[in-house]
Amino acid sequence: FERTRSLQDPCSNCPAGTFCDNNRNQICSPCPPNSFSSAGGQRTCDICRQCKGVFRTRKECSSTSNAECDCTPGFHCLGAGCSMCEQDCKQGQELTKKGCKDCCFGTFNDQKRGICRPWTNCSLDGKSVLVNGTKERDVVCGPSPADLSPGASSVTPPAPAREPGHSPQ
């Protein structure tokens, strides 16, 4: 099949990185600068993707493959194949139409992207709050109050840095 078709269509003999030039009696010409063909037999080369503005080049265009973009510092990729760049925010913030805004009380965001999410409700699992939540961190749930015997502490106190009575060396 391949052989018979290549006799009918000389363009089938043009490999990736070239195009079948109708203006030059269908000979295979190299793709011009800033263009590529990732398969053979193309009658034109495809224009390379240009990474401009907040996009930066992650992989240069070659004669056989398109360029790949990512985002400049302070921005992150959105969408498959980094089709968009979105502004980073600080931890404890989320991006709104008016820019970066602090998470409301009761919510947190531990990343530079995404939205503020509600703190975990420990009581839904029958647990108590061990460490309070902040704008940047979720609450830490501890054992349920019933699990704690009277007088027992829910947190093990830290070991002293050195034994009392010993002077530092």
Partner: nanobody, 126 residues
């Protein structure tokens, strides 16, 4: 998960028109070349048309040139095939396919494409 779903097929009279759609999901649609193939009853797979990642360059089989138009909307992750002046010999199951990032084969060869839809039937009869 990469998915391609064709729609828009049906029965039409000779000289009529149809527009096929291919909805893509699960991957960076705008980064890949796309193509349409067809398979007539009892025949092999035939390449129809191919479109660059950005819609900038197109290639057509001689049998459909001037009658079919391939296009894409990267914002909607959709590939189209506008078919006009349809003939009985255009009767086939039409498939959309994603072009590989690199292929040593040419664009008319199925091996150049890695993902395929399930197809939509186009029937042209009086």
């Amino acid at each position: 998960e990469v998915q391609l779903l064709e729609s828009g097929g049906g029965e039409v009279q000779p000289g009529g028109s149809l527009r096929l759609s291919c909805a893509a999901s699960g991957w960076a649609f705008g980064n890949y070349g796309m193509a349409w193939f067809r398979q007539a009853p009892g025949k092999g797979l035939e390449w129809v048309a191919r479109l660059a990642w950005n819609g900038g360059s197109t290639d057509y089989a001689e049998s459909v040139k001037g009658r079919f138009t391939i296009s894409r909307d990267n914002a909607k992750n959709t590939l189209y095939l506008q078919m006009s002046s349809l003939r009985a010999e255009d009767t086939a199951v039409y498939y959309c396919a994603r072009q590989r990032s690199y292929s040593r084969y040419d664009i008319r060869t199925p091996q150049t494409y890695d993902y395929w839809g399930q197809g939509t039937l186009v029937t042209v009869k009086p």
